[in-house]
Amino acid sequence: KESCDVQLYIKRQSEHSILAGDPFELECPVKYCANRPHVTWCKLNGTTCVKLEDRQTSWKEEKNISFFILHFEPVLPNDNGSYRCSANFQSNLIESHSTTLYVTDVKSASERPSKDEMASRPWLLYS
């Protein structure tokens, strides 16, 4: 029979190169059965993960999977870093793997670098 444990799935692509000033949605894929768990986002700061309290979030329900979304409207340079979502369900805490955002500041990039440029010039990601 199908397990009804809450699962925080992973996305194959766990790194995102994005441009400051653009909108962006960070998705936390969640599987649950009857009761939707309480899910939160946090940002990694060294070994601790700082809870993001006052950020816009939403749920998107799909057939096989649900997504708890952290909205960046717009992306800011200091959004650069690693994020993790956590689910509270029946007093159990489940943590996801981390997802990393590499933010390019528009002030230092006259135009959006291509994917190839990102790969060949990783310093662009941190400028």
């Epitope: 397990s3 699962q7 996305k11 766990s14 799909e62």
Partner: antibody
């Protein structure tokens, strides 16, 4: 029936580059959900994952070895090639390739079926 | 990076006994991504369990997996002589996608 077989040199000198080939049959590396991984095992030690290539040419590397590794695939030849630069005696190990299968929905991995078939392994000694 | 710690390092039992092998993750792992392997001397590893509890093709039902979060268990209900080997747990993640435990050696008492 899925089979994989590793081939490459048995002896490599320090600082040289190792090139290993995984030749497989029974599946296509252009089929969605399929991957091939490389794993090594030094004598008497535990398994260590090295690299992974997916059907869509997405590649993943062990963070500690990323700068030395390159994985490529040739779908028409049913081969995956791993190169490892700047070999050192500590890289002496048996190197395995393995078939991996996942189910993905909108980029989300909803099932991982493990490394379900492995090659027999090839032993590589690094020595001058 | 998620670290998998297996215990005990060595388990000495007799044929017919029950074996319980533990795998503890440094951070919670979805059971979807947890697998177990058996390796005999001079052979490649063999997949036993995937998804924490699903038996791979051809694996006898004396092998079972369980657990969630950070604690996972491989149980062999009645040990057969051919079950004495090294067992590894493995998780599939995002960065890095694959990590193995250090192994548990199951030896004949």
């Amino acid at each position: 029936q899925i089979t994989l077989k590793e081939s490459g040199p048995t002896l490599v000198k320090p600082t040289q580059t190792l090139t290993l080939t995984c030749t497989f049959s029974g599946f296509s590396l252009s089929t969605s959900g399929v991957g091939v991984g490389w794993i090594r095992q030094p004598p008497g030690k535990a398994l260590e994952w090295l690299a992974l290539i997916y059907w869509d040419d997405d590649k993943r590397y062990s963070p500690s070895l990323k700068s030395r590794l390159t994985i490529t695939k040739d779908t028409s030849k049913n081969q995956v090639v791993l190169t490892m630069a700047n070999m050192d005696p500590v890289d002496t190990a048996t190197y395995y390739c393995a078939h991996i299968r996942i189910t993905e929905v909108r980029g989300v991995i909803i099932s991982y079926y493990g490394m379900d078939v492995w090659g027999q392994g090839t032993t590589v000694t690094v020595s001058s | 990076e998620i670290v998998l710690t297996q215990s005990p390092g060595t388990l000495s039992l007799s044929p017919g006994e029950r074996a319980t092998l533990s795998c503890r993750a440094s951070q919670s792992v979805s059971s979807t991504y947890l697998a177990w392997y058996q390796q005999k001397p001079g052979q490649a590893p063999r997949l036993l369990i995937y998804g924490a509890s699903s038996r791979a093709t051809g694996i006898p039902d004396r092998f079972s997996g369980s657990g969630s979060g950070t604690d996972f268990t491989l149980t062999i209900s009645r040990l057969e002589p051919e079950d004495f080997a090294v067992y590894y747990c493995q998780q599939y993640g995002s960065s890095p996608p694959i990590t193995f435990g250090q192994g548990t050696r199951l030896e004949i008492k």
